[in-house]
Amino acid sequence: TTSAEKNTCQLYIQTDHLFFKYYGTREAVIAQISSHVKAIDTIYQTTDFSGIRNISFMVKRIRINTTADEKDPTNPFRFPNIGVEKFLELNSEQNHDDYCLAYVFTDRDFDDGVLGLAWVGAPSGSSGGICEKSKLYSDGKKKSLNTGIITVQNYGSHVPPKVSHITFAHEVGHNFGSPHDSGTECTPGESKNLGQKENGNYIMYARATSGDKLNNNKFSLCSIRNISQVLEKKRNNCFVESGQPICGNGMVEQGEECDCGYSDQCKDECCFDANQPEGRKCKLKPGKQCSPSQGPCCTAQCAFKSKSEKCRDDSDCAREGICNGFTALCPASDPKPNFTDCNRHTQVCINGQCAGSICEKYGLEECTCASSDGKDDKELCHVCCMKKMDPSTCASTGSVQWSRHFSGRTITLQPGSPCNDFRGYCDVFMRCRLVDADGPLARLKKAIFSPELYENIAE
């Protein structure tokens, strides 16, 4: 085969008991993994890395640590209070030679607004990133540095899916060899030019993202240059040809009827597990209508749930999902009317998603009450609105200027929301806490790794 066909990075995704606790069921956790992988797959597939195209991702294996594994001594992620560097290290202490990358998803509130951490790839002489094999390091431990971690929690709030997807793409971007974006060309969101600024920053921006600006889910030219060099050198080491579905990864892919994982994971009476012979694995057992692995509208008794059963909770912007009686998938929910308030009155619904700012309800657009504009620091975590394309009219929702719409009531950003022009995140006390993009790196310098590794870890 030609190297051009080796374009798929196979992933091992683990989730800890806190991630499971938040999402509640194995099926919901698998749906989260699937949506994250699909999101980065779309981003990377549509990026031309200096002639290297169609880079894709496939889940090779998953491990879901449930709340039952919280006390299991073989579960390295069982500890309740671990910092982000230690959490990444626990992942790296496992052997991940069978995978391009190995990630752990968690629901932990790490210090200083950190949403993820990963080892940075380099074209040569590197320890870390894609395809890196397990080896002995100076602290006397074997480690796999083809690793990263992400969390879905920030300052006590859960980040929106689009932000979490970009976090995953960002951390994987480090693994692929990209450092943080810097310089005017690659950080347009910091520009004084309004036309450039409004498109926002790229995936590898060092600080905060809202996920809804044009550039937020694209790689900058700086990232593309770095990633293409690493892909050129490294992808032949572990990337595979895309194609066949992977039976046993818990995700029902094209060509599979169901997928309940391997025999040690499969709790499903409906589906043949991945350890079965070729003709049977990932197929429905005889006489079974469906498998819960196909979706939430299938019972544990392998039958479609009845028409009236709920399969998705009502949310701010969408009505509850109701099974239709003839598929295991949960049908799309009806959207609530556009401009319905959501996310505690800080945003509005657009086409069933909590996507717009509350400002849009009144023909305004959201702006940052940024200290560089001479605004009071106390306003950095207020929702602020301005007239379209007119930053000179940026004012807090609590200001007299917008009192006709908000009646003088200050609407504050949710904890974990970007603030001060994406330099930081709001904490629970409504203070804008600047993101120290290289904090964990600095702490690791004092930890167990030898000096040659210092440059190769990043948020």
């Epitope: 009144y362 023909g363 009219t393 200027q401 917008w402």
Partner: nanobody
Framework: EVQLVESGGGLVQAGGSLRLSCAAS????????IGWFRQAPGKEREGVSC????????YYADSVKGRFTISSDNAKNTVYLQMNSLKPEDTAVYYC????????????????WGQGTQVTVSS
């Protein structure tokens, strides 16, 4: 097309009164806030008072509170500024401005402006 025409300015002795009018046309009067602003020679334009036409809520600069009163006649699409106990420091060109979204005394927030009327207070 939005049009604002001020009238009622003139020369008055300190302690006297004037009533300024702002006649509006070309827009749905009820949807807007109307503000009065003034600019003295060599100084920045400053907000004096404003009114939200739909609900009648008003706002005043500290320097004119208790002396100036803003009101509107929705049938005539006109906003008035009654100025009592005038002082020499009230001397300026007085402008009215209108905006569909904003309110308050920051001139940056107002999209539509009249030509202004001169008020001179002699001591």
């Amino acid at each position: 097309e939005v049009q604002l025409v001020e009238s009622g300015g003139g020369l008055v002795q300190a302690g006297g009164s004037l009533r300024l009018s702002c006649a509006a046309s070309g827009f749905t009067f009820d949807d807007y806030a109307i503000g009065w602003f003034r600019q003295a020679p060599g100084k920045e334009r400053e907000g004096v008072s404003c009114i939200s036409v739909s609900d009648g809520s008003t706002y005043y600069a500290d320097s004119v509170k208790g002396r100036f009163t803003i009101s509107s006649d929705n049938a005539k699409n006109t906003v008035y500024l009654q100025m009592n106990s005038l002082k020499p420091e009230d001397t300026a060109v007085y402008y009215c401005a209108a905006d569909r979204l904003a309110y308050g005394l920051d001139p940056n927030f107002y999209d539509h402006w009249g030509q202004g009327t001169q008020v001179t207070v002699s001591s």
